[in-house]
């Protein structure tokens, strides 16, 4: 699952929101990495034009540095996950009426997208910011 | 819903200790940090530490370092919340509230805690 | 620890009004800051999340600015539920810390 290496993110739609020259994760359970991860958040970026204002640039920035981990390199370069607290923020304040309309429609299966990535990263299950804080990235 | 529902108010005297209790119910317990936070009569909020009920671990304000332990219960999602060697200052209302800065904001209705001789 | 400072500890004002609390961090908190209002013998309630971040159910003359050490709670056109104690959290590290409190009565 966390197979892969660090390289210098090259693709456009995380441009904006990921640091210049970041090194991310690119994971080896795709055949090509760097297309599919971009596919992946292209398709969901796309979603993200419906959402408010205030969730947007949260959500994406979620979305860009879940898909695109910050990664720190070493013998086994290794993908550093979001900070919990980060996440929960985006899911409960910046978003949380998408968050609701979304999990709602995904529960009664009217729903499948990729902006139901977003969900992927489970908040409880993240390192924290207070207590693991170099286990995971600040946004 | 998501509730938070705390344990009566509690008479206590000097140099003795206290249990406050605080019921979570309508998520899911342990994927969210519990704070303790007091406020004695007539005074501002004051931060006394944090539990996270998944694995138990604790945060302190180190001002009752020594004097406080949070603990918690996953079979009936409650967390508790001990002051040992209590003195007339500990008089406040304790309030746990769920994640406080982070998440949506919800808090216990608060536990009057008196301490007199 | 952070020291997180309020002011003015009270203020009266009217009405109408337009009313800025002010919240000094000890240190830089990025913008991990959270406003509180409080009535007499209610549980307090979150307005403000991370600087500026509208709670949802808040009015929007309640809004909040600033970044690193600096942050200001504004109410715009002062209502007469508005009178209570507000209060600033930093959420950046362990200990949290509240601001003192701002005690806003009416004039």
């Known amino acids: 699952d966390n197979k892969g290496y660090c390289a210098q993110y090259r693709g456009e739609v995380c441009n904006a929101v990921l640091a210049k020259d970041a090194l991310v994760f690119l994971n080896t359970s795709y055949a090509d990495p760097e297309e599919a991860q971009e596919l992946l958040v292209h398709t969901a970026w796309n979603e993200l034009k419906v959402v408010s204002p205030v969730c947007r640039p949260a959500a994406e920035a979620l979305l860009c540095n879940h898909i695109f981990q910050e990664c720190s390199p070493g013998v086994v370069p290794t993908p550093i996950p979001i900070c919990r607290e980060y996440c929960l923020a985006v899911k409960e304040l910046f978003c949380a009426k998408e968050w609701l309309v979304m999990e709602e429609k995904t529960h009664r299966g009217l729903y499948r997208s990729e902006m139901h990535l977003l969900s992927v990263p489970e908040c409880s299950k993240l390192p924290s910011m207070h207590w693991d804080p170099t286990a995971c990235a600040r946004l | 819903q998501v509730q938070l529902v705390q344990s009566g108010a509690e008479e206590k005297k000097p140099g003795a200790s206290v249990k406050v209790s605080c019921k979570a119910s309508?998520?899911?317990?342990?994927?969210?940090?519990m704070h303790w936070v007091r406020q004695a009569p007539g005074q501002g909020l004051e931060w006394m530490g944090i539990?996270?009920?998944?694995?138990?671990?604790?945060s302190y304000a180190q001002k009752f370092q020594g004097r406080v332990t949070m603990t918690r219960d996953t079979s009936t999602s409650t967390v508790y919340m001990e002051l040992s060697s209590l003195r007339s200052e500990d008089t406040a209302v304790y309030y746990c509230?769920?994640?406080?800065?982070?998440?949506?904001?919800?808090w216990g209705q608060g536990t009057l805690v008196t301490v007199s001789s | 620890d952070i020291q997180m400072t309020q002011s003015p500890s009270a203020m009266s004002a009217s009405i109408g009004d337009r009313v800025t609390i002010t919240c000094r961090a000890s240190?830089?908190?990025?913008?991990?800051l959270a406003w509180f209002q409080q009535k007499p013998g209610k549980v307090p309630k979150r307005l403000i999340y991370v600087a500026s971040g509208l709670q949802s159910g808040v009015p929007s003359r309640f809004s909040g600015s600033g970044s690193g050490t600096e942050f200001t709670l504004t109410i715009s056109s002062l209502q007469p539920e508005d009178f209570a104690t507000y209060y600033c959290?930093?959420?950046?590290?362990?200990?949290?810390?509240f601001g003192q409190g701002t005690k806003l009565e009416i004039k």
């Open positions: 240190q830089d908190i990025s913008n991990y």
């Open positions: 309508g998520y899911t317990f342990t994927n969210y940090y």
């Open positions: 959290l930093q959420h950046n590290s362990y200990p949290f810390t």
């Open positions: 509230a769920r994640e406080l800065g982070w998440g949506s904001d919800y």
């Open positions: 539990i996270n009920p998944s694995g138990g671990n604790t």
